[in-house]
């Protein structure tokens, strides 16, 4: 996966970092106080398609194969940059009962980007 | 995840069989000849976007809460119906060396969509 | 280098409080969070609780809530802890220690020795 | 709570030797623990996080397995500066936990 140098506009991934105090969560995750979520940005012409790499890799070939041949409705099928990578991340926090809890939450973090 | 009935244009997930012989992967695939990959289709208006459910939910529920507030540069960037929950599923096929393995290829069904 | 430098020892009376500071350097303090734990002579180590700069929590251990208070001032970078209703048995050495990842207590103050007698 | 156990509660041995600690947990805690070393009137000192992640600057002769509810810190070749106490600690759930300690003393 690429990583935005500001230099192309391909489908890459962005550096971001979450401050859960800006989003209002801080009254109910209590650590960390923010974090490198990062996200994905960027054209997907369809030659980058399915480009392998990205963990949908096998499906988004396949139906690439439909799209770049012009197979309906694919041909309208807009490939989009989306996350194809993400870490979970350790968060200690105040569940419904106000137990606290500490969990690895799945899906936190973007590491790599792709094209659907 | 939503399944696509014709009655919505909300990000769902639309049956599709694909054909091995089709794509000219019959070759090298042994079995099966096709199977259901399906495919994600469908707007992502801001408010469904990151919904729950999602395998990219805490994430995209995060960015969502940016792009809500209109925070540069996430107000212009888009929602994405992509698959959220993919299945693997058996493969026999040749490799490289003319050699017949069976395995389990990631991510090869769409099992659910949702809005990145 | 990263430090934790904590305030001298105290000879308290039953029933008094004592507080305890600690001032951090060499990181940026509301990065990570600051947790007591306490060490009885000739036993072992007991966490007392945490207090998070970041998010503005602390988190206690049931069996001191109540009875402790953990405080920050993030102008002079300093985590404090307060005992109070002190007894014979909070006799101990109180260290401060940085969270490197949560719950985990990756560098540590030299300790703080508490005596409680009357 | 998560009760930490640990065993021995002393060990005695001499330089070269290999040394092994257990410790066990009242429930599952994966791979969320750590092991710290405190020689007399010192602070204690992080040297496994993670049940088998080496903290920077600690000797490789130091090593770290397990999860679940078992694990173990091994010495492979005991030298001098390591004779202290040992100390896991879980680092799962809230309150994190600690177990009574290793004394590893000199035979």
């Known amino acids: 996966g690429l990583e935005c140098d500001g230099k192309v506009n391909i489908c890459c991934k962005k550096q971001f970092f979450v401050s859960f105090k800006d989003i209002g969560w801080n009254d109910w995750i209590i650590a960390p106080s923010g974090y490198h979520a990062n996200y994905c940005e960027g054209e997907c012409p369809s030659h980058i398609a399915g480009t392998s790499g990205s963990s949908l890799s096998f499906h988004s070939t396949v139906i690439n194969h439909y799209r770049m041949r012009g197979h309906s409705p694919f041909a309208n099928l807009k490939s989009c940059c989306v996350p194809t990578k993400l870490r979970p991340m350790s968060m200690l926090y105040y569940d419904d009962g106000q137990n606290i809890i500490k969990k690895d939450i799945q899906n936190m973090i973007v590491e790599e980007c792709g094209c659907s | 995840g939503l399944e696509c009935d014709g009655k919505v244009n909300i990000c769902c997930k639309k049956q599709f069989f694909v054909s091995f012989k089709d794509i000219g992967w019959n070759d090298w695939i042994i079995a099966p000849s096709g199977y259901h990959a399906n495919y994600c289709e469908g707007e992502c208006p801001s408010h469904i976007a990151g919904t729950s459910g999602s395998s990219l939910s805490f994430h995209s529920t995060v960015i969502n809460h940016y792009r809500m507030r209109g925070h540069s540069p996430f107000a212009n960037l888009k929602s994405c119906c992509v698959p959220t929950k993919l299945r693997p599923m058996s493969m026999l096929y040749y490799d490289d060396g003319q050699n017949i393995i069976k395995k389990d290829i990631q991510n090869m069904i769409v099992e659910e969509c949702g809005c990145s | 280098q990263v430090q934790l430098v904590q305030s001298g020892a105290e000879v308290k009376k039953p029933g008094a409080s004592v507080k305890v500071s600690c001032k951090v350097s060499?990181?940026?303090?509301?990065?990570?969070?600051i947790s007591w734990v306490r060490q009885a002579p000739g036993k072992g180590l007991e966490w007392m609780g945490g207090?998070?700069?970041?998010?503005?929590?602390?988190i206690y251990a049931q069996k001191f809530q109540g009875r402790v208070t953990m405080t920050e001032d993030t102008s002079t970078d300093t985590a404090y802890m307060e005992l109070s209703s002190l007894k014979s048995e909070d006799t101990a050495v109180y260290y401060c220690?940085?969270?490197?990842?949560?719950?985990?207590?990756?560098?540590w103050g030299l300790g703080t020795a508490v005596t409680v007698s009357s | 709570d998560i009760q930490m156990t640990q065993s021995p509660s002393s060990v005695s041995a001499s330089v070269g030797d290999r040394v092994t600690i257990t410790c066990r947990a009242s429930?599952?805690?994966?791979?969320?623990l750590a092991w710290y070393q405190q020689k007399p009137g010192k602070a204690p000192k992080l040297l496994i996080y993670?049940?088998?992640k080496l903290e920077t600057g600690v000797p490789s002769r130091f090593s770290g397995s397990g999860s679940g509810t078992d694990f173990t810190l091994t010495i492979s070749s005991l030298q001098p500066e390591d004779f202290a106490n040992y100390y896991c600690?879980?680092?799962?759930?809230?309150?994190?936990?600690f177990g009574g300690g290793t004394k590893v003393e000199i035979k």
């Open positions: 220690a940085r969270e490197g990842d949560i719950f985990v207590m990756d560098v």
């Open positions: 060499g990181y940026t303090f509301t990065s990570s969070a």
């Open positions: 207090i998070y700069p970041g998010s503005g929590h602390t």
């Open positions: 429930m599952d805690i994966r791979n969320d």
């Open positions: 993670d049940a088998s």
């Open positions: 600690q879980q680092a799962k759930s809230f309150p994190p936990t």
